[in-house]
Interface confidence: medium
């Protein structure tokens, strides 16, 4: 099933996804992909965690929450209309057929007000790509960069609203949070 989330052009979009680790530090690998969750793995991977850390990401996609506590919500920085679409959060619980997968629909709306042109920070220059890695499947043979040092105030109001406990409970009810162990 799909849950819909909205953001405006130029904002950071927030796509919530949570699980409850069986024990502190007992992490489960997670992948985020652009597109609905396929048969297995994530299609068109944009970010991945393993049992210890974020081990793969692409330039505008990052985890702002405490993924070590199971908050694997995805932040997409400075969205454009092209970022609209379905995203897959897949919690890769070991074992056969155990994966939890969530399809989240991101709708990008044009900005209400066009601000005066400002010089955008060049993340390519600020955070050079410096490492190539191979993980599971071909999607990981890409370059990595350092995570942007970004101010929390840049996160859209949607992100803050979604942290509200009432909404968090709604998310749990809709199946976007799972407990492991």
């Amino acid at each position: 099933s799909e849950v819909e989330y909205r953001a405006e052009v130029g904002q950071n979009a927030y796509l919530p996804c949570f699980y409850t680790p069986a024990a502190p530090g007992n992490l489960v690998p997670v992948c985020w992909g652009k597109g609905a969750c396929p048969v297995f793995e994530c299609g068109n991977v944009v970010l991945r965690t393993d049992e210890r850390d974020v081990n793969y990401w692409t330039s505008r996609y990052w985890l702002n929450g405490d993924f070590r506590k199971g908050d694997v919500s995805l932040t997409i920085e400075n969205v454009t209309l092209a970022d609209s679409g379905i995203y897959c959060c897949r919690i890769q619980i070991p074992g056969i057929m155990n994966d939890e997968k969530f399809n989240l629909k991101l709708v990008i709306k044009p900005a209400k007000v066009t601000p005066a042109p400002t010089r955008q920070r060049d993340f390519t220059a600020a955070f050079p790509r410096m490492l190539t890695t191979r993980g599971h499947g071909p999607a990981e043979t890409q370059t990595l960069g350092s995570l942007p040092d970004i101010n929390l105030t840049q996160i859209s109001t949607l992100a803050n609203e979604l942290r509200d406990s009432r909404l968090a409970n709604d998310l749990r009810d809709s199946g976007a949070t799972i407990r492991i162990g």
Partner: antibody, heavy 114, light 112 residues
């Protein structure tokens, strides 16, 4: 329903170039990666490449890094495989297969003969 | 590269019989995330391969329950409980755990 439709058979001479296509329908093209797989006559399957259709970035098997080019026309939901300087050993059926190889095209036969 | 070895090369069966195909990999196919990306395909003459079983034992949509997969690590088996005429063709195992993705050489299921 999900379909991958490939272009028709090709007969080429050694040294020539061939370009075959794979048109996807029934799903959003850029939401799933695309593979190309080679099958020589009477032989098994050999994975060639996986292309991230969202970023355009390919990952090759080592055997297919030289004379093989893989491209996308996302507006037409189409992936392309081009082989330059064709050799006899390129004679095969080439399949496109979606993402985790759950759906396949019907295959395109390429025959290289002088 | 991971080498996938299938046995037997050819498997003559009578309709209604059980058939069993083995696939062995040169390295463990257990990924660091705990999953095992071993899949089975059937290719009928003149057709493209069709996914039957993914991740060792999960039937793809529309695949009859007479097909089952099992195994772990490096040794895997595809079983067909009661062979029907439409099951004839070449069966391939495939691994997606390690790049490059590789296939077994195939097992031809044919009538005795």
């Amino acid at each position: 329903q999900i379909q991958l439709v490939q272009s028709g058979p090709e007969l080429k001479k050694p040294g020539e170039t061939v370009k075959i296509s794979c048109r996807a329908s029934g799903y959003t093209f850029t939401n799933y990666g695309m593979n190309w797989v080679k099958q020589a006559p009477g032989k098994g399957l050999k994975w060639m490449v996986w292309i991230n259709t969202y970023t355009g970035e390919p990952t090759f098997a080592d055997d297919f890094k030289g004379r093989f080019a893989f491209s996308l026309e996302t507006s037409a939901s189409t992936a392309y495989l081009q082989i330059i300087n064709l050799k006899n050993e390129d004679t095969a059926t080439y399949f496109c297969a979606r993402d985790t190889m759950d759906y396949w095209g019907q295959g395109t036969s390429v025959t290289v003969s002088s | 590269d991971i080498v996938m070895t299938q046995t037997p090369l050819s498997l003559p069966v009578s309709l209604g019989d059980q058939a069993s195909i083995s696939c062995r990999s040169s390295q463990s196919l257990v990924h660091s995330n705990g999953n095992t990306y071993l899949h089975w395909y059937l290719q009928k003459p003149g057709q493209s391969p069709k996914l039957l079983i993914y991740k060792v034992s999960n039937r793809f949509s529309g695949v009859p329950d007479r097909f089952s997969g099992s195994g772990s690590g490096t040794d895997f088996t595809l079983k067909i409980s009661r062979v029907e005429a439409e099951d004839l063709g070449v069966y391939f195992c495939s691994q997606n755990t390690h790049v490059p993705w590789t296939f077994g050489g195939g097992t031809k299921l044919e009538i005795k």
